[in-house]
Interface confidence: low
């Protein structure tokens, strides 16, 4: 490495002296430092040596020698202090900018050592600097401020004690920009308001920016409204807040209210719908049909939205009916979301026992109102069939129950079978109109179709096969000799 | 933020009323039930009754029904309970709290503390 | 009314304990909120409609339950949950509150 004349670190002399710095080295070397236009350089040996024949303050500062040839071996420094009693500082620049995060160097240099004890940071104006800043002072560099952040962007001054006197250096401006620059965040409450007319209402519109120069605005549609603005300073930021407050709200207060916030970065605009009604309001509605089909132990969701200012304040489900028996607890939910409700009423693998009516029940100022949903189960069928003589005659009865209500389809087939479909069949017979025995709401159907044979034919199978949307069933009939017959279940009576 | 800021204590003689306020701020006050509650010193919670503040309706416990008298003034978003005809019974600590809708009082009052002795 | 029977009265528990308060109502109701009350305080909501937490509270609460049986427990004590903690139903008016369950530190 290079070597300095004289030798350092530091070196300290008075105002008017002439300063030498002389850097010896095997080959041409370079100074580094706040040179010009205080110094002079030797010109028999260019680069080399460094002169000031009267030296004052602005000498002062750290002066490095580099060899051109070879950077890697390294530099040598040494600090100069031209200690001038009327000059306590020598500013290195008067202004700063940094990126958000770095380390900000304030380069007020103290021009003598003996100061360094005494010396302090002020924002300008006699302000303190910030809690949060973090810093300290280094007699070569200046005041360091770590991690600076947005907020620290001030003027800043250095002092120290001269003799028992105050010496103050003039201001350094230090910028400290974001590391990506953004318009302010904005925030508009509430996110949607509705008010009867006459009640009272507010509507708050804020910013928050690292910086103070933004501006924020509250509009109704295009009208810029003309409201106080507040200022604040909280957490690091700066905050600016309009209040449109209203006493007694009339139907020209609704509308789209927009927050309009905006610094040199650009605009966020957060916007929200006051209405204004007559009167308190519940409305219930359901996107699902309020008649409801599902088979036995399918699983169904009966939603509720409500639509209600002021808040609802009571509710409920109920099961009406008709079957009580076997009742289990209803199980259901309720999503809160502004002046929106959303009921959910859960019915888990339906029971035969839980068809019937289910009824929410919703209240708030506006009174009682309500909704029914009615719930029908689909049966597959199921089939019976019997023989009886009526008036001499032989007459096949088929009892068929299920919902929706089974068709019926008679067939006679050849044979000791138990399998026969229309193809195979001698006469298929569809009964269109079948007797209804049963037919409650909500329950299954009953019916009940005749197949009049007059006499029953020896080897002969008769099948009342039945369907609906949920499955079929049938079930045969045989006759096993005369004076004898014989009733069988088909061997699969539930084919979904 | 909302905010229900009761009177402060009182100490009266048996047969004499009083009246507790609870202000309210940070909220629409007209638009929300107000409820009161009643604590007895190392007893449960009570409910009292509610007033909707929008309109003077009121909701009341039957056990305070003649003991307790609920009103609300929006000009100054302030509600208030009377209790007349005091015993030693109706010492208690008794609050303010508001619903905003569904099953929940959202926020109470810090409690006003009422005190009957002769 | 319904009444609201709360248990256990008092119980202490050690921090990182799981904790476990019940409430039986009297008769069926849709929802129960749960309030934490600290000496001198008011109380404050905790829990509403069986098992929403409250703003602000640690996801280490949690409630369930239905009909007439609710529960309220805390998967892990920590000193500051030591309270006393109030089951409250709204089904019906009257509003009824339990009697209160006292969580002590050990």
């Known amino acids: 490495a290079p070597v300095i004349e004289p030798s350092g670190p530091e070196l300290v002399v008075e105002p008017g002296e002439t300063v030498t710095l002389r850097c010896v080295s095997n080959g041409s070397v370079e100074w580094d430092g706040p040179i010009s236009p205080y110094w002079t350089l030797d010109p028999e040996s260019p680069g080399s040596t460094l002169t000031t024949r009267n030296a004052t303050f602005k000498n002062t500062g750290t002066y490095r020698c580099t060899e051109l040839e070879d950077p890697m071996a390294g530099s040598t420094t040494i600090h100069l202090y031209v200690k001038d009693p009327a000059h306590s500082w020598n500013l290195l620049a008067q202004e700063v900018t940094v990126v958000e995060g770095q380390e900000a160097v304030l380069p007020c240099l103290i021009t003598d050592p003996a100061l360094k004890d005494s010396v302090s940071l002020m924002r300008e104006g006699g302000r303190q600097v910030l809690r949060k800043t973090v810093y300290f002072f280094s007699p070569w560099r200046g005041f360091i401020i770590r991690k600076a952040k947005v907020l620290d962007s001030n003027t800043y001054v250095c002092k120290t004690m001269v003799n028992g006197r105050e010496s103050t250096s003039t201001g350094i401006w230090l910028k400290v920009n974001r590391v990506h620059p953004e318009p302010p965040q904005i925030k508009l409450e509430p996110s949607k308001l509705v008010r009867i007319r006459g009640e009272a209402a507010q509507i708050v519109c804020s910013a928050t920016n690292a910086e103070v120069g933004f501006n924020v605005i509250l509009k109704r549609g295009d009208t810029k409204l003309e409201i106080p603005l507040n200022s604040d300073f909280q957490d690091n930021y700066y905050k600016k807040v309009r209040a449109l407050s209203l006493n007694a709200v009339d139907f020209q207060d609704a509308g789209i209210y927009s927050c309009v916030a905006s610094n040199d970065v650009g605009t966020r605009t957060a916007t929200m719908n006051f209405q204004v009604v007559e009167s308190a309001y519940l409305n219930l509605t359901s996107e699902q049909s309020l008649l409801q089909e599902v088979s036995v132990g399918d699983s169904l969701i009966l939603t509720v939205h409500a639509d209600a200012y002021p808040s609802i304040q009571h509710y409920n489900w109920t099961y009406l009916g008709p079957f009580f028996e076997d009742q289990r607890k209803l199980e259901f939910i309720t999503q809160r979301a502004i002046y929106r409700y959303t009921f959910k009423l859960f019915l888990n693998r339906v029971k035969a026992s839980e068809a019937g009516q289910y009824f929410l029940m919703a209240q708030n100022k506006a009174g009682w109102n309500n909704l029914t949903f009615e719930l029908t189960l689909r049966y597959p069928p199921e089939v019976s069939v019997t023989w009886m003589p009526v008036n001499g005659s032989d007459v096949l009865f088929c009892d068929v129950s299920g919902y929706p209500q089974p068709s019926v389809t008679w067939m006679e087939c050849r044979g000791h079978t138990d399998r026969c479909d229309e193809a195979q069949a001698l006469q298929v017979w569809n009964d269109t109109h079948p007797e209804v025995l049963s037919q409650k709401p909500f329950d299954k159907v009953i019916i009940q179709s005749q197949l009049p044979i007059g006499t029953l034919k020896h080897n002969m199978t008769y099948f009342c096969k039945t369907h609906n949307s949920v499955g079929n069933s049938s079930q045969y009939f045989r006759a096993v000799s005369l004076g004898q017959s014989k009733q069988l279940p088909d061997e699969s009576l539930f084919t979904p | 933020q909302v905010q229900l800021q009761q009177s402060g204590a009182e100490l009266v003689k048996p047969g004499s009323s009083v009246k507790i306020s609870c202000k309210a701020s940070?909220?629409?006050?007209?638009?929300?039930?107000m409820h009161w509650i009643k604590q007895q010193p190392g007893n449960g919670l009570e409910w009292i009754g509610w007033?909707?503040?929008?309109?003077?309706?009121?909701e009341y416990n039957q056990k305070f029904n003649g003991k307790a008298t609920l009103t609300a003034d929006k000009s100054s978003s302030t509600a208030y309970m009377q209790l007349s005809s005091l015993t030693s019974e109706d010492s208690a600590v008794y609050f303010c709290?508001?619903?905003?809708?569904?099953?929940?009082?959202?926020?109470w009052g810090q409690g006003a503390s009422v005190t009957v002795s002769s | 009314e319904i009444v609201l029977t709360q248990s256990p009265t008092t119980m202490a528990a050690s921090p990182g304990e799981k904790v476990t308060i019940t409430c039986r109502a009297s008769?069926?109701?849709?929802?129960m909120s749960w309030y934490q009350q600290k000496s001198g305080a008011s109380p404050k909501p905790w829990i509403y409609?069986?098992?929403k937490l409250a703003s602000g509270v640690p996801d280490r609460f949690s409630g369930s339950g239905s009909g007439t049986s609710y529960s309220f427990t805390i998967s892990s004590m920590e000193t500051e949950d030591a309270a006393t903690y109030y089951c409250?139903?709204?089904?019906?008016?009257?509003?009824?509150f339990g009697s209160g369950t006292k969580l002590e530190i050990k």
């Open positions: 409609e069986t098992s």
């Open positions: 008769s069926s109701t849709n929802y």
């Open positions: 940070g909220y629409t006050f007209t638009s929300n039930f």
């Open positions: 007033i909707y503040p929008g309109d003077g309706d009121t």
């Open positions: 709290a508001v619903n905003y809708g569904g099953y929940v009082l959202d926020a």
């Open positions: 409250h139903q709204w089904s019906s008016t009257p509003l009824t």
